[in-house]
Interface confidence: low
Amino acid sequence: HPICEVSKVASHLEVNCDKRNLTALPPDLPKDTTILHLSENLLYTFSLATLMPYTRLTQLNLDRCELTKLQVDGTLPVLGTLDLSHNQLQSLPLLGQTLPALTVLDVSFNRLTSLPLGALRGLGELQELYLKGNELKTLPPGLLTPTPKLEKLSLANNNLTELPAGLLNGLENLDTLLLQENSLYTIPKGFFGSHLLPFAFLHGNPWLCNCEILYFRRWLQDNAENVYVWKQGVDVKAMTSNVASVQCDNSDKFPVYKYPGKGCPTLGDEGDTDLYDYYPEEDTEGDKVRATRTVVKFPTKAHTTPWGLFYSWSTASLDSQMPSSLHPTQESTKEQTTFPPRWTPNFTLHMESITFSKTPKSTTEPTPSPTTSEPVPEPAPNMTTLEPTPSPTTPEPTSEPAPSPTTPEPTSEPAPSPTTPEPTSEPAPSPTTPEPTPIPTIATSPTILVSATSLITPKSTFLTTTKPVSLLESTKKTIPELDQPPKLRGVLQGHLESSRNDPFLHPDFCCLLPL
């Protein structure tokens, strides 16, 4: 070709028109072009319709082209990667109809100040979205709803002050979230949902440590090994986790995960609070963490949580990482989950000291509770493995343009193994949530003293109680299947659906599962 460099690599016909001072698409490019580099030209405006003759085009690099407008017309049915980074776009073009097969979209280092609600509509195949280095202040709540396959999301280096509570809803494949270097001061309750997020970058934000931060604090404690500091040019797999990088802006860079939360309302105080925010005091004994006697009081009204972390009993696991396939009530962080009217919990539940030991992760899913009183472990067929298979190899491709088919700018340099931060010894009370409409209480409000019996096998770990009786004889158990500082989660099951599925979860009583 007279202007561009053409090369054939395997089945790919790659055309490199980088840095040719082009103001438009050069004529007469090979019709079977699969990869087209147009980086560092002076295109200013560009119409995707001009590429319609290139029906095999799978990768298009338009980075550093001084683009102020991208016209989206026609259809490029197999285009999978579009790099628009380092341009001057002030609005994100609606690409869904034009690029139905898009899997990687890089719009980093543009001038985006906002995104419309339907910005990603039609991009159902999208796996990687890079919006780093723009000027975004807020995001529309349902922004990512059209992209359920999303694996990597970079919102780093923007001006974000807040995040919509349900932003990550339904993103079961998300493995890398980059939120560093924004203006975030809190994380809404339930923001992370219940699925595992192996790589989170949250540093460089002015986190405001007050009672509103307790949900985030607990999430950090539970996911300490998954919180990293971004280092340019270093592959996330080679980075060392650093939960202490997430620091309170209002208290001399104190790590958020250690924030004591003194003076914040706790469960049992006046008002309704989210279960996830209350945890027992913990004291450490070498390799173990003891959860001291915990009293959890539930109010005499239907308990509402704006994020639904009530586990289906059949999916509750003792592994510190939550399964990615969970009860439907966990999938929406916006919808509120209210106990059905026929069950109004009003009891005190005591859990005597249970000691958890940190040992290697169980990679097997939890098993459903059998219907007999003697539980027999059996794999749950519909559940995915706890360990995330995807290891992000492209954490932040926007740091540099990516004109060739090689992976854009991840890197790997040996780094020490992640160290587990010591758990905090303070309770984690939470602010009260909006109270739901009170419902009449049931006639009896029993106090149930439970020390959960357990059946532990190498492949599955779960707790079950066979009948609602006081079990005081087993006051201390060592459970060897946990790998992290233990997480004690009050798990109440009040959903009609799950009580249909499990005879032991009768709505007249409730079980506490330490997780």
Epitope: D18, K19, S39, E40, F109, G133, E135, N157, N158, N159, E181, G204, K231, Q232, G233, V234, D235, A238, E396, P397, T398, S399, E400, P401, A402, P403, S404, T406, T407, P408, E409, P410, T411, S412, E413
Partner: antibody, heavy 118, light 113 residues
Framework: QVQLVESGGGVVQPGRSLRLSCAAS????????MSWVRQAPGKGLEWVAS???????YYPDSVLGRFTISRDNSKNTLYLQMNSLRAEDTAVYYC????????????WGQGTLVTVSS | DIVMTQSPDSLAVSLGERATINCKSS????????????LAWYQQKPGQPPKLLIY???TRESGVPDRFSGSGSGTDFTLTISSLQAEDVAVYYC?????????FGGGTKLEIK
């Protein structure tokens, strides 16, 4: 540990060409942006070229059109093809690893001297 | 291009004393999005390549002694060696890593008085 070893320097006449190489080890070469920085005798540092992990090259105006940076990830080697050399290109040429778009240089080689003289 | 100007050209300081080197850029190196200044400092000893000391104005590279510190914002920056050691004799360069082409200051030669 990270090591960068330059080679290919020498004495060359003005207008001629020279190709420098930089052998990298101790890190995943293909994943890092790489650069050449030069230092004329007794002078300061001057950035010459960079190439991203994906292969996109960048140059300052002083060498644009004369120098070409390239990389062979299979050989963990960085190259600098220098054409139409001038006397003012005389310098020690350092190969440096950079962290990406931030483009400061965290590891440097020992350098190779290029002398352009008639 | 962003021009980097260092001062002084040379500096003689007694062992154990504080050394201060200044660097001025022709335009701001502050990224308003993340409030970071994109300035790095390097140390070059005779016959050796440069060594990264500090980036983002004040972040010390791993392994760099804490007697080295960086400060400043916008266009004016400072490298401080709190207590000069014999091994600190070198030429020090600032570099902006804010905008291509990446440019260096002219260098400051630090000697022992």
């Amino acid at each position: 540990q990270v090591q960068l070893v330059e080679s290919g320097g020498g004495v060359v006449q003005p207008g001629r060409s020279l190709r420098l190489s930089c052998a990298a080890s101790g890190f995943t070469f293909s994943s890092f942006a790489m650069s050449w920085v030069r230092q004329a005798p007794g002078k300061g540092l001057e950035w010459v070229a960079s190439i991203t992990s994906a292969g996109t090259p960048y140059y300052p105006d002083s060498v644009l059109g004369r120098f070409t940076i390239s990389r062979d990830n299979s050989k963990n080697t960085l190259y600098l093809q220098m054409n139409s050399l001038r006397a003012e290109d005389t310098a020690v040429y350092y190969c440096a690893r950079s962290r990406g778009y931030e483009d400061y240089f965290d590891y440097w080689g020992q350098g190779t001297l290029v002398t352009v003289s008639s | 291009d962003i021009v980097m100007t260092q001062s002084p050209d040379s500096l003689a300081v007694s062992l154990g004393e504080r050394a201060t080197i200044n660097c001025k850029s022709s335009q701001s190196l502050l990224n308003s999005r993340n409030q970071k200044n994109y300035l790095a400092w390097y140390q070059q000893k005779p016959g050796q390549p440069p060594k990264l000391l500090i980036y983002f104005t004040s972040t010390r590279e791993s392994g760099v002694p804490d007697r080295f510190s960086g400060s400043g914002s916008g266009t004016d920056f400072t490298l401080t060696i709190s207590s000069l050691q014999a091994e600190d004799v070198a030429v020090y360069y600032c570099q902006q890593h804010y905008s291509s082409p990446w440019t260096f200051g002219g260098g400051t030669k630090l000697e022992i008085k």
